[in-house]
């Protein structure tokens, strides 16, 4: 696993412990909470990052209408179970033996049950809609410039292949970024859209996961873009399974920087 050799840190994940105990005295970094060795040349999986976070000390419509099966992460933080590759296990349980099934981004996609609950497979989240509202700016943003800058950001900062950024929509002050990545499209070594979205989410909350970098400075032709609130919608390859009670129980609030994992539908 590559890491900065000079001072042995992980550029892409500050929630690691690094030491020169790899082969030939090379720097090796392990995620906090799980102790799993991470590849510091790319993004760390969201599952390992959530586990590390839980182990740390506490501190004319052009816009897309999220589809009825879109999940919003209303449950918030939990200490997840990750598989040896760092992916979320399909079934997650808490300390009180309450269990539920999650998708590939770790968002609950079934009602909660007990230890008898079965989650046959990890369902892939293939479409992520990041919905942002930006702060009023002195200068207006040009849509094509904004599109280019956000695509550059996902390519350069999050190492996400450009083909996975499906669209950028802009209807001031709302920006929507659509990420799409089917199982068949994702090649070995490709950054997962769920991981890229999580890094972006943390960046726009001022909680960068990158080592030693200041906060994300995002400019469009020199004009800074500041984010007032973020909502992230997750769509799975197989629609989620919730009881009718939940589906008719009203929508979810969307305060500043909450990403509410909902299920809405096209």
């Amino acid at each position: 696993h590559t890491a900065a050799q000079d001072n042995c840190t992980c550029p892409t994940n500050k929630m690691t412990v690094c030491s020169p105990d790899g082969p030939g005295g090379r720097c090796q970094c392990r995620a906090l909470g799980s102790g799993v060795a991470v590849d510091c040349s790319t993004l760390t999986s969201k599952c390992l990052l959530l586990k590390a976070r839980m182990s740390a000390p506490k501190n004319a419509r052009t816009l897309v209408r999220p589809n009825e099966h879109a999940l919003v992460d209303n449950d918030g933080l939990y200490d997840p179970d990750c598989d040896p590759e760092g992916r979320f296990k399909a079934r997650q349980c808490n300390q009180t033996s309450v269990c539920w099934c999650v998708n590939s981004v770790g968002v609950r996609r079934t009602d909660k049950g007990d230890l008898s609950l079965r989650c046959d497979e990890l369902v892939r989240t293939h479409h992520i809609l990041i919905d942002l509202r930006h702060r009023p700016t002195a200068g207006a943003f040009n849509h094509s410039d904004l599109d280019a800058e956000l695509r550059r950001l996902f390519r350069e900062r999050y190492r996400l292949h450009p083909k996975f950024v499906a669209a950028v929509h802009y209807e001031q002050p709302t920006i929507q970024i659509e990420l799409r990545q089917n199982t068949s499209q994702k090649a070995a070594g490709d950054v997962d859209i769920g991981d890229a979205a999580y890094y972006f989410e943390r960046d726009v909350k001022g909680e960068s996961l990158f080592q030693g970098r200041g906060g994300l400075d995002l400019r469009v032709r020199g004009e800074p873009l500041q984010v007032e609130r973020t909502l992230i919608y997750y769509l799975d390859e197989i629609p989620p399974k919730f009881s009718m009670k939940r589906l008719t129980g009203g929508g979810s609030g969307g305060g500043s920087h909450h990403h509410h994992h909902h299920h809405h539908h096209h």
Epitope: G139, V204, G206, D217, R221, G222, P224, L225, Q226, V227
Partner: antibody
């Protein structure tokens, strides 16, 4: 630490041009914009415009449009502000100031250069 | 152009007293920035985004307000606080500053 050092005082004749430099150090030069603000004797602060070194984007105050030119030399981390067709009322202290920003906050103008006195007199 | 009007123009106070400086905008702004300027020195940022203390600024300085009315408060004046204070908006171009409030020793 972050520092902006400006060129020395200038005396110019009406109709001439002046070019003031602002050399940045202590941070990644291309990561924030450099603004120019002037203060005329006995007056308040007046914003002239900014330039963003990463891509050369700039924004000028309408009042100075056509008379002001901001340029950047990334090899020396220096920004230049040229004001042409000088008149006596352009006599002022000219400041450069950097503005850091993130997706969370706009951190205002901080720090400022020490200022350059430009005197326009016949 | 957004006009920022500061009041009072001059504030005469003694060390240890509380100073309250006002900045009124001609139209609604989202955030205000406050600067301190001493004779012969460049301005220094005190407050960004209305209420956040800039790096290295003592906690006796605080900012508040919204819409068109904003306030800079110095809870207990120190001798080095006697200076001119300016508010600034970043809501629309051109960026504008208030005309300044001079805080002088009584």
């Amino acid at each position: 630490q972050v520092q902006l050092v400006q060129s020395g005082a200038e005396v110019k004749k009406p109709g001439a041009s002046v070019k003031v430099s602002c050399k940045a150090s202590g941070y990644t030069f291309t990561s924030s914009d450099i603004n120019w603000v002037r203060q005329r004797p006995g007056q308040g602060l007046e914003w002239m415009g900014w330039i963003y070194p990463r891509d050369g984007s700039k924004k000028y105050a309408q009042k100075f449009q056509g008379r002001v030119t901001m340029t950047v030399d990334t090899s020396t981390s220096t920004v230049y502000m040229e004001l042409s067709s000088l008149r006596s009322e352009d006599t002022a202290v000219y400041y450069c100031a950097t503005r850091f920003a993130t997706v969370v906050s706009n951190y205002g103008l901080d720090p400022w250069g020490q200022g350059t006195l430009v005197t326009v007199s016949s | 152009e957004i006009v920022l009007t500061q009041s009072p123009a001059t504030l005469s106070l003694s060390p240890g007293e509380r100073a309250t400086l006002s900045c009124s905008a001609s139209s609604s702004v989202n955030y205000i920035y406050w600067y301190q300027r001493k004779p012969g020195q460049a301005p220094r940022l005190l407050i960004y985004d209305t209420s956040n203390l800039a790096s290295g600024i003592p906690a006796r300085f605080s900012g508040s307000g919204s819409g068109t009315d904003f306030t800079l408060t110095i809870s207990s004046l120190e001798p080095e606080d006697f200076a001119v204070y300016y508010c600034q908006q970043w809501n629309s171009y051109p960026l504008t500053f208030g005309q300044g409030t001079k805080v002088e020793i009584k």
